[in-house]
Interface confidence: low
């Protein structure tokens, strides 16, 4: 099992966050998802900059809208339970960025679809993990 060092713990949490985001992307990109067209009409705010753990504040602020969009996707082919999923992501995000942070998120001018939003945060996790390893 992974060691208890702070770096290893951070890496594990980022891997879990990454996996959760990939789970959502897999679910909504599933060719059997009849709600995808409608889901793509929802707009998400993207961070102007996302290079450090404190920037996860921007993801945290978009978790409620993400849950609302995922609630649309409920069907027998969408196996993710939005409330459980978002709750888990929120716990990981809080642990990673720290709950005492006073960082104010700056958003880009352009909004994004759910797919673009998820891909942006997946890339964020991957890049941070790469620096840890």
């Amino acid at each position: 099992a992974p060691t208890s060092s702070s770096t290893k713990k951070t890496q594990l949490q980022l891997e879990h966050l990454l996996l959760d985001l990939q789970m959502i992307l897999n679910g909504i990109n599933n060719y059997k998802n009849p709600k995808l067209t409608r889901m793509l009409t929802f707009k998400f705010y993207m961070p102007k900059k996302a290079t450090e753990l404190k920037h996860l504040q921007c993801l945290e602020e978009e978790l409620k809208p993400l849950e609302e969009v995922l609630n649309l996707a409920q069907s027998k082919n969408f196996h993710l339970r939005p409330r459980d999923l978002i709750s888990n992501i929120n716990v990981i995000v809080l642990e990673l960025k720290g709950s005492e942070t006073t960082f104010m998120c700056e958003y880009a001018d352009e909004t994004a679809t759910i797919v673009e939003f998820l891909n942006r945060w997946i890339t964020f996790c991957q890049s941070i993990i790469s620096t840890l390893t």
């Epitope: 996996l19 959760d20 990939q22 992307l25």
Partner: antibody, heavy 113, light 107 residues
Framework: QVQLVQSGAEVKKPGASVKVSCKAS????????MHWVRQAPGQGLEWMGV????????TYAQKFQGRVTMTRDTSTSTVYMELSSLRSEDTAVYYC??????WGQGTLVTVSS | DIQMTQSPSSLSASVGDRVTITCRAS??????LAWYQQKPGKAPKLLIY???TLESGVPSRFSGSGSGTDFTLTISSLQPEDFATYYC?????????FGQGTKVEIK
């Protein structure tokens, strides 16, 4: 010690379903994602999907969408993988793996008429 | 899906030999590569993760290197217990995918 113990071998007829269990012990079951991987006789490893034992939600490889269901019982630290509409090409050893560093011993599922 | 291609598919070597197995990804996977060893009738065993980090308890004769699309597993001095099949695996992008395996046999 840290281990995953899987249920015993199964023989099924085409069209039937099989449910394989994987019981965790020696570590915090809910902390690590549980993957399922299968290996057909003489073949390589094929990822089927993953479940978050904490939240209970799962995602599956496209190939198995609609046929596989992964669930968990936190009270017994057990995850389950159910595969339906079995065909002969589903004959394989099915493994559970927690965090990739702990693997079950494998469960042979034979599909034959 | 990201394809993982291993080479060679099999090789014959003697105890004490230096053995190198390569794995190529169809697109960049950064350092998200792991190596597994599998013996007949047994579950795979994690050897290396994050390209080059040795799993606890794995002998130091095993090492991994590479980045992006090209990766290498090296066994510096092959031991009798190392004769097995080796798999690479990427977890950079879902779905997780494995190489087809490299069987290391006794010459």
């Amino acid at each position: 010690q840290v281990q995953l113990v899987q249920s015993g071998a199964e023989v099924k007829k085409p069209g039937a379903s099989v449910k394989v269990s994987c019981k965790a012990s020696g570590f915090t079951f809910t902390r690590y994602y549980m993957h399922w991987v299968r290996q057909a006789p003489g073949q390589g490893l094929e990822w089927m999907g993953v479940i978050n034992p904490s939240g209970g939600y799962a995602t599956y490889a496209q190939k198995f969408q609609g046929r596989v269901t992964m669930t968990r019982d936190t009270s017994t630290s057990t995850v389950y993988m159910e595969l339906s509409s079995l065909r002969s090409e589903d004959t394989a050893v099915y493994y559970c793996a927690s965090g990739w560093d702990v693997w079950g011993q494998g469960t042979l599922v034979t599909v034959s008429s | 899906d990201i394809q993982m291609t291993q080479s060679p598919s099999s090789l014959s070597a003697s105890v004490g030999d230096r053995v190198t197995i390569t794995c190529r990804a169809s697109q960049s996977i950064s350092s998200w590569l792991a190596w597994y060893q599998q013996k007949p009738g047994k579950a795979p065993k994690l050897l290396i993760y994050a390209t080059s980090t040795l799993e606890s308890g794995v002998p130091s004769r095993f090492s991994g290197s590479g980045s992006g699309t090209d990766f290498t597993l090296t066994i510096s001095s092959l031991q009798p217990e190392d004769f097995a099949t080796y798999y690479c695996q990427q977890s950079y992008s879902s779905p997780v995918t494995f190489g087809q395996g490299t069987k290391v046999e006794i010459k």
